[in-house]
């Protein structure tokens, strides 16, 4: 079950795990997106452009992700189901300048064991 103040599109179940979508403005060309659970950084993705507009992606925490021109989706395979946790996205903008840092969408996520069980059965 998804609880809290976030837009429900931020969270969706996916193959026994949770997909968390962090949206950002299409105007933004170079960025760093971080996903937090409370104060812990779970995932970090940096998109930059080099010469000839070649895109470089850095994913130092080796998270499963999907990047589009207005969102980064992170896939958590083993979400903490013991208690409700607050997840939020933090966006750092490098282009267009000047540098901006913003905490964006966030919300509480409470996952019941039965949900993961059912999702897992479907996946298997």
């Amino acid at each position: 079950e998804i609880n809290g103040s976030a837009d429900h599109r931020m969270f969706s179940f996916h193959n026994g795990g949770v997909q968390i979508s962090c949206k950002y403005p299409e105007t933004v060309q170079q960025l760093k997106m971080r996903l937090f659970r409370e104060r812990e950084v779970l995932c970090e993705l940096t998109k930059t452009k080099g010469s000839g507009n070649a895109v470089s992606i850095k994913n130092p925490m080796l998270c499963l992700y999907h990047l589009s021109n207005n969102s980064v989706s992170f896939f958590l395979n083993n979400p903490d189901s013991s208690q409700g946790s607050y997840y939020f996205c933090s966006l750092s903008i490098f282009d267009p300048p000047p540098f901006q840092e913003r905490n964006l969408s966030g919300g509480y996520l409470h996952i019941y064991e039965s949900q993961l069980c059912c999702q897992l059965k479907l996946w298997l």
Epitope: Y24, P25, L91, D95, P96, P97, P98, Q100, R102
Partner: antibody, heavy 125, light 109 residues
Framework: EVQLVESGGGLVQPGGSLRLSCAAS????????MHWVRQATGKGLEWVSA???????YYPGSVKGRFTISRENAKNSLYLQMNSLRAGDTAVYYC???????????????????WGQGTTVTVSS | EIVLTQSPGTLSLSPGERATLSCRAS???????LAWYQQKPGQAPGLLIF???SRATGIPDRFSGSGSGTDFTLTISRLEPEDFAVYYC??????????FGQGTKLEIK
């Protein structure tokens, strides 16, 4: 009242230096990106430099390496250190506030919404 | 590098007429990044329009902005004596971070 007041302009010889100051009041200075924009007599507006809220700085090629923008949030002040001045740097220099906000879906640019009255810099021998 | 070109350089009209000022970008820009300014003799510029079409605080509704991509327009529906001034378009972006058009002088015919 939201206000920007420039000072420090004057006459300087080519190759010389000058430091411009801008005193901000009436708003939370540290929350805004700031710019210097100049205008030579009878000419158009030219962007000179910018500084972000995090202290990151930006310059066009025409002044890069010669001009340095800085800010002192505790004093609500913006500065422009100008070195190796040339005749082509002669202009009125404006201190300008830039307003923008970011949400998860939109990057809103509200334009340069507050301008100072300008300070005149003359580079001549 | 994005270059903004304004036309005409000078526009001669009479009070009560409609003024149409053009700003063309050398490459496509986001409409949210375009602004217009008015400058009267001996004064600092003032913000008129932001986001290509949104009027700044206190700007009369006879001023309107439109356009997208590379072509943007500032329209003054019915000129008042105080509207005769120089108008600049401006964009924020990456290279350079900020640039202005060369200006359009709106003068009394």
């Amino acid at each position: 009242e939201v206000q920007l007041v420039e000072s420090g302009g004057g006459l300087v010889q080519p190759g010389g230096s000058l430091r411009l100051s801008c005193a901000a009041s009436g708003f939370t200075f540290s929350s805004y990106d700031m710019h210097w924009v100049r205008q030579a007599t009878g000419k158009g507006l030219e962007w000179v430099s910018a500084i972000g809220t995090a202290g990151d700085t930006y310059y066009p090629g025409s002044v890069k390496g010669r001009f340095t923008i800085s800010r002192e949030n505790a004093k609500n002040s913006l500065y422009l250190q100008m070195n190796s001045l040339r005749a082509g740097d002669t202009a009125v220099y404006y201190c300008v506030r830039d307003k923008r906000t970011v949400t998860h879906e939109h990057y809103y640019y509200y334009g340069m919404d507050v301008w100072g009255q300008g300070t005149t810099v003359t580079v001549s021998s | 590098e994005i270059v903004l070109t304004q036309s005409p350089g000078t526009l001669s009209l009479s009070p009560g007429e409609r003024a149409t000022l053009s700003c063309r970008a050398s490459q496509s820009i986001s409409s949210s990044s375009l602004a217009w300014y008015q400058q009267k003799p001996g004064q600092a510029p003032g913000l008129l329009i932001f986001g290509a079409s949104s009027r700044a605080t206190g700007i009369p509704d006879r001023f309107s902005g439109s356009g997208s991509g590379t072509d943007f327009t500032l329209t003054i529906s019915r000129l008042e004596p105080e509207d005769f001034a120089v108008y600049y378009c401006q964009q924020f972006g990456s290279s350079p971070m900020c640039s202005f058009g060369q200006g359009t002088k709106l003068e009394i015919k």
